[in-house]
């Protein structure tokens, strides 16, 4: 690699060389001083080149010599203005100035892009005293330049509260292209165009871009950075990268995978978390999302009873949290359950179906046609009813609970009776005469006690008065008269 030092906008060359004001590192510089460390930089510039005071900040001393000759204006000697070199090479550059010996405590500081360079920089100042003046040489070396070393370097010296500033030395570190924007992985719709962007910088400029798709070059000719590739659509996954070229060589971006959005895979591992008489809590593990986020899921429920009509209940829910409570189910019933989820492309297939059962519940309806008689001879109240419909028993009947409330002259007393499931009649003793007896009956399963029937009232007279007429509740929706034999 050629390291070029160029003096810009100056009337005469600094070095003899291949072109004015330039230096190639392949050639030996006119003067190179070894470092104390023994490290030989790629490029060194000597302060002892013929020079002239620069036109920048100049301090004109007011002191005159014994012969009353005015001292010359103080200024840094002119040095190289522009150094171009490759990354990781070494460089050394310097400022020099001759200061009359009357000045004490002169120090030189280095500045880069307007900020003073302090601390761990390789800056060395050497003093060469003579009879009248001291030559001061401030050297700055960088052993392995990086892009961050690019910039404008100057020396500053303070004398008599005057600041003397050198001409800038521009350091340009050249290297392989450096990506400032690389293509990003994406999930795209099949056969739909999309854009990828690639941007790289030097120096040196220009930087040219080549796009690569599945290891084939997309553009036959280089495109100036930044480059936007419009991919006209894909039918299958593809890998893209971009190559950035400059005079120093080639840098290749990371390869990015572009995926094609597809319908999701079906959910897996549908499982029953909890069952009640009328609900089932299920969970599932979502399948692969097809490179597109899940939107929602559908739970499909079929009665597993071979005699059922095969209709499917569908429950829609959000995709998260992969849990759903299926409600409004029948008790003690078997169901087949499947789950399907969708993304922006469409619905997945249904998961493998699983079998689930609801538990026994309390009956959902009360016994029907409750009828109450007063049997005065035995001083009992006879109660009769009809079983609730099988479908609404929600389990296996274990019996009935009878509530009878006796009300007389401001006194009220409720009693409960449990009777077995075999009969559909019961007999209770009269508790109070000259009172109203209110009867309600509920069916009982292992799942619990169902709702009570509507109250049936019968008046229990004082001893000796007989009323044969029964009191009853008609069966819901049944307009036929109840016949009691």
């Amino acid at each position: 690699a050629i390291t070029e030092a160029r003096e810009e906008a100056k009337p005469y060359p600094l070095f003899p060389g291949p072109f004015p004001g330039s230096l190639q590192t392949d050639h030996t510089p006119l003067l190179s001083l070894p470092h104390a460390s023994g490290y030989q930089p790629a490029l060194m510039f000597s302060p002892t080149q013929p020079g002239r005071p620069h036109t920048g900040n100049v301090a004109i001393p007011q002191v005159t010599s014994v012969e009353s000759k005015p001292l010359p204006p103080l200024a840094f000697k002119h040095t190289v203005g522009h150094i171009i070199l490759s990354e990781h090479k070494g460089v050394k550059f310097n400022c020099s100035i001759s200061v009359p010996n009357i000045y004490q405590d002169t120090t030189i500081s280095w500045w880069k892009d307007g900020k003073e360079l302090l601390g761990a920089h390789h800056a060395i100042t050497q003093f060469y005293p003579d009879d009248e003046v001291t030559a001061i040489i401030a050297s700055f070396s960088i052993t392995s330049v990086q892009r961050s070393d690019n910039g404008s370097y100057i020396c500053k010296m303070k004398i008599n509260n005057e600041e003397i500033v050198s001409d800038p030395i521009y350091i340009e570190v050249q290297g392989l292209p450096h990506f400032t924007k690389q293509p990003e992985s994406m999930n795209v719709t099949r056969n739909t165009a999309f854009n990828l962007t690639c941007q790289a910088v030097g120096p040196p400029e220009p930087v040219n871009i080549f796009w690569v798709q599945n290891s084939s070059r997309v553009n036959e000719q280089p495109e100036k950075s930044p480059s936007v590739l419009t991919v006209p659509g894909l039918t299958e996954m593809a890998v893209f990268s971009c190559e950035a070229h400059n005079d120093k060589g080639l840098t290749v971006s990371k390869g990015v995978q572009i995926n094609i959005k597809a319908i999701p895979s079906p959910p897996t591992e549908v499982s029953i978390r909890n069952s009640t008489a009328h609900s089932i809590l299920i969970s599932w593990v979502p399948g692969f999302d097809g490179y597109s986020p899940f939107r929602n899921c559908s739970i499909q429920v079929k009665e597993a009873d071979p005699l059922s009509n095969g209709s499917v209940m569908i429950f829609n829910t959000s995709a998260l949290p992969h849990l759903y409570q299926i409600k409004q189910l029948q008790a003690l019933a078997n169901y087949s359950i499947g789950v399907s989820c969708m993304n922006e492309i469409g619905w997945s297939a249904v998961s493998p179906w699983i079998l689930a059962s609801t538990t026994e519940g309390a009956p959902s309806v009360a016994p029907l046609n409750v009828t109450v008689f007063l049997n005065e001879s035995s001083d009992n109240v006879d109660i009769r009813w009809m079983k609730p419909p099988t479908k609404q028993q929600d389990g296996e009947l274990v019996g009935y609970r009878i509530s009878h409330v006796w009300q007389s002259a401001g006194i009220s007393k409720e009693l409960l009776e449990e009777v077995g499931q075999n009969g559909s009649r019961a007999r209770i003793s009269v508790q109070v005469h000259n009172a109203t007896c209110t009867v309600r009956i509920a069916a009982v399963t292992r799942g619990g006690v169902g709702p009570f029937s509507d109250p049936v009232k019968i008046f229990i007279p004082a001893h000796g008065w007989v009323d044969y007429a029964p009191s009853s509740t008609p069966a819901p929706g049944n307009a036929d008269p109840v016949l009691i034999i």
């Epitope: 056969n191 997309v218 553009n219 036959e220 000719q221 039918t235």
Partner: antibody
Framework: QVQLVQSGSELKKPGASVKVSCKAS????????VHWVRQAPGQGLEWMGW????????TYAQGFTGRFVFSLDTSVSTAYLQISSLKAEDTAVYYC???????????WGQGTLVTVSS | EIVLTQSPATLSLSPGERATLSCRAS?????MHWYQQKPGQAPRPLIY???NLASGIPARFSGSGSGTSYTLTISSLEPEDFAVYYC?????????FGGGTKVEIK
């Protein structure tokens, strides 16, 4: 608008040479490659190769090396196809085309008929 | 070199009919371009990158396919559509053309 204008028909004797020109206009010449396509009488299209207008580097398809030379004059936005030692089987219409991304040939010259006959 | 085989070589149809032209590649390609050529004229671009209509091409033309199998469809033939159609692959050099399908009036 983009145009590729080719030189006129040529009648040559076997062993002679011919140089077909293709002048581009309506776009930046050095941004797109120039491809050459041959079509023999009554036959299909045959890709001959292309020239990189940025670097000047030619690429030749198999069967088109040696006697076929692609060249450029970027100052006048023109690509050239030169065929030397002409044979009767070189008789064909030669098309220049502009190559874009994905090797798509989006603009074609009108074609130049080269007839080789003694 | 990727060989492109077009079929049928000739397709005889009437105006208004649907034309389906096939192009098969000897190995998988990234995209297929299609060109139309009429007698005495230069080819003109028809479909870019498998399924994108070139500018000025009517919507009755469509392209599809992937891998090694690609199709050009003309939904309802117009009199001006009777011509020779060529496919051309993008994937690897050399850039090859198919042998062409001639769509002629029955």
């Amino acid at each position: 608008q983009v145009q590729l204008v080719q030189s006129g028909s040529e009648l040559k004797k076997p062993g002679a040479s011919v140089k077909v020109s293709c002048k581009a206009s309506g776009y930046t010449f050095t941004n797109y490659g120039v491809h050459w396509v041959r079509q023999a009488p009554g036959q299909g299209l045959e890709w001959m190769g292309w020239i990189n207008t940025y670097t000047g580097e030619p690429t030749y398809a198999q069967g088109f090396t040696g006697r076929f030379v692609f060249s450029l004059d970027t100052s006048v936005s023109t690509a050239y196809l030169q065929i030397s030692s002409l044979k009767a089987e070189d008789t064909a219409v030669y098309y220049c085309t502009r190559g874009t991304r994905y090797a798509y040939m989006d603009y074609w010259g009108q074609g130049t008929l080269v007839t080789v006959s003694s | 070199e990727i060989v492109l085989t077009q079929s049928p070589a000739t397709l005889s149809l009437s105006p208004g009919e649907r034309a389906t032209l096939s192009c098969r590649a000897s190995s998988s390609v990234g995209y297929m371009h299609w060109y139309q050529q009429k007698p005495g004229q230069a080819p003109r671009p028809l479909i870019y990158a498998t399924s994108n209509l070139a500018s000025g091409i009517p919507a009755r033309f469509s392209g599809s396919g992937s891998g090694t199998s690609y199709t050009l469809t003309i939904s309802s033939l117009e009199p001006e559509d009777f011509a020779v159609y060529y496919c051309q692959q993008w994937s690897s050099n050399p850039r090859t053309f198919g042998g062409g399908t001639k769509v002629e009036i029955k």
